[in-house]
């Protein structure tokens, strides 16, 4: 039994780091491996992933952190039975893969405006909680073509935009995703997506109802 | 062996500043999120706020906001608080404690005393 | 605030014999990773704070196993089975889950 590809991990920066790998042939990971990781640190215990199949020959592993500091450094032990496969180390915070944010809602009730929430995905005591920065998706369900990306930099988890940028009388999807530059981390998983049915009164109708009114005067 | 130890006692009149130190051994802080507890005279423990040495990152209880700041020194394996506008309620002890993911850890304390 | 409420606050027990302290949470100290960080601390006279109980049921390394914890949610216990006189000073239990942390008021045990 042998390692085809070596371990590689991701970290949320709070408390799950996901490692990945293959084996040389089909494998029951939960029966045949275990992965051991400590922290390097006073008091640090070993702790024991029980590793689950990601396809015939995958295994993935979900490594429980209580905390995560910027310095952190885990050493990696791969076991099957009483032979060691391989031995390795992560840095959570050179391999941070955020959070996705949750809770978007878009609120339809402010005149003309499109008003896009969604919760921060981090406590106020993580690092990453005023670091993030997100991307929503828009996307029409009638046209394919009609799909846009906004991009928001600032802090606030919220998004608004003018109903009239999207159109009228159909119904639209959005979702979101976080990625954090001071860690330069890859992008979350979209967040679930959300539906409403955008409904507007088009400045042409309106236009056309005003100059119609003033033909009558 | 592991130990932290702080700045000795200090006395300062109502309105001015009082910066204490507390320097790490046997550890690195960059390891750990380094926090400060306050305890006045005969009174229980309050938690005052707390850095991760290696980004700087800060976070206060809400009661000392403003007038509290937690720094460190990763060069000296150093924790400094600072509080400013004293008062007479600030005499206490201060604890700086390292904690990873808990008060394993706690300095001696430092007396300040506010008094005019 | 997360406010923790301790009971008793002074405790007066016969060497060799059982004590309990109570602590109850405000709202819910479970964290979003999953982790209650509820901690026990004794303080003893004339010196800093040292750690009992982490993440509820955890002994610190060193410490004797006469004291344990339990609870859940918003309701938390330490227990000594039997007292010993090395055992007086003030305990302090402690929510690390929700900034702003907090202490308990603590409560105070002496020996009989």
């Known amino acids: 039994m042998k390692v085809l590809q070596e371990p590689t991990c991701v970290s949320d920066y709070m408390s799950i780091s996901t490692c990945e790998w293959k084996m040389n042939g089909p494998t029951n990971c939960s029966t045949e491996l275990r992965l051991l990781y400590q922290l390097v640190f006073l008091l640090s215990e070993a702790h024991t992933c029980i590793p689950e199949n990601n396809g015939g020959a995958g295994c993935v592993c979900h490594l429980l952190m209580d905390d995560v500091v910027s310095a952190d450094n885990y050493t990696l032990d791969l076991w099957a039975g009483q032979q060691l496969l391989w031995k390795g180390s992560f840095k959570p915070s050179e391999h941070v893969k955020p959070r996705a944010p949750g809770n978007l809602t878009v609120h339809t009730n402010v005149s003309d405006t499109l008003l896009l929430t969604w919760s921060n995905p981090y406590p106020p005591d993580n690092y990453l909680y005023n670091h993030l920065t997100y991307a929503v998706n828009i996307w029409s369900e009638n046209d394919p073509a009609d799909f846009r990306i906004y991009n928001v930099t600032y802090l606030e988890p919220s998004l608004r935009i003018a109903a009239s940028t999207l159109k009228s009388g159909i119904s639209y999807r959005a979702r979101v995703r976080a990625w954090a530059q001071c860690y330069n981390t890859t992008w979350s998983e979209w967040s679930p997506s959300t539906k409403w049915h955008n409904s507007y009164r088009e400045p042409f109708e309106q236009h056309h109802h005003h100059h119609h009114h003033h033909h009558h005067h | 062996e592991v130990q932290l130890v702080q700045s000795g006692a200090e006395v300062k009149k109502p309105g001015a500043t009082v910066k204490i130190s507390c320097k790490a051994s046997g550890f690195n802080i960059k390891d750990t999120y380094m926090h400060w507890v306050k305890q006045a005279p005969g009174k229980g423990l309050e938690w005052v706020g707390r850095i991760d040495p290696t980004n700087g990152y800060t976070i206060y209880a809400s009661k000392f906001q403003g007038r509290v700041t937690i720094t460190a020194d990763t060069s000296t394996n150093t924790a400094y608080m600072e509080l400013s506008s004293l008062r007479s309620e600030d005499t206490a002890v201060y604890h700086c404690?390292?904690?990873?993911?808990?008060?394993?850890?706690w300095g001696q304390g430092t007396l300040v005393t506010v008094s005019s | 605030d997360i406010v923790m409420t301790q009971t008793p606050l002074s405790l007066s027990v016969t060497p060799g014999q059982p004590a309990s302290i109570s602590c109850r949470s405000s709202?819910?100290?479970?964290?979003?990773?999953?982790?209650?960080?509820l901690e026990w601390y004794l303080q003893k006279p004339g010196q800093s704070p040292q750690l009992l109980i982490y993440?509820?049921?955890n002994r610190f390394s060193g410490v004797p196993d006469r004291f344990s914890g339990s609870g859940s949610g918003t309701d938390f216990t330490l227990k000594i089975s039997r007292v010993e006189a090395e055992d007086v000073g003030v305990y302090y239990c402690f929510q690390g889950s929700h900034v702003p942390y907090t202490f308990g008021q603590g409560t105070k045990l002496e020996i009989k």
């Open positions: 993440k509820v049921t």
């Open positions: 709202q819910s100290i479970v964290h979003s990773n999953g982790n209650t960080y």
């Open positions: 404690v390292s904690r990873r993911p808990w008060f394993a850890y």
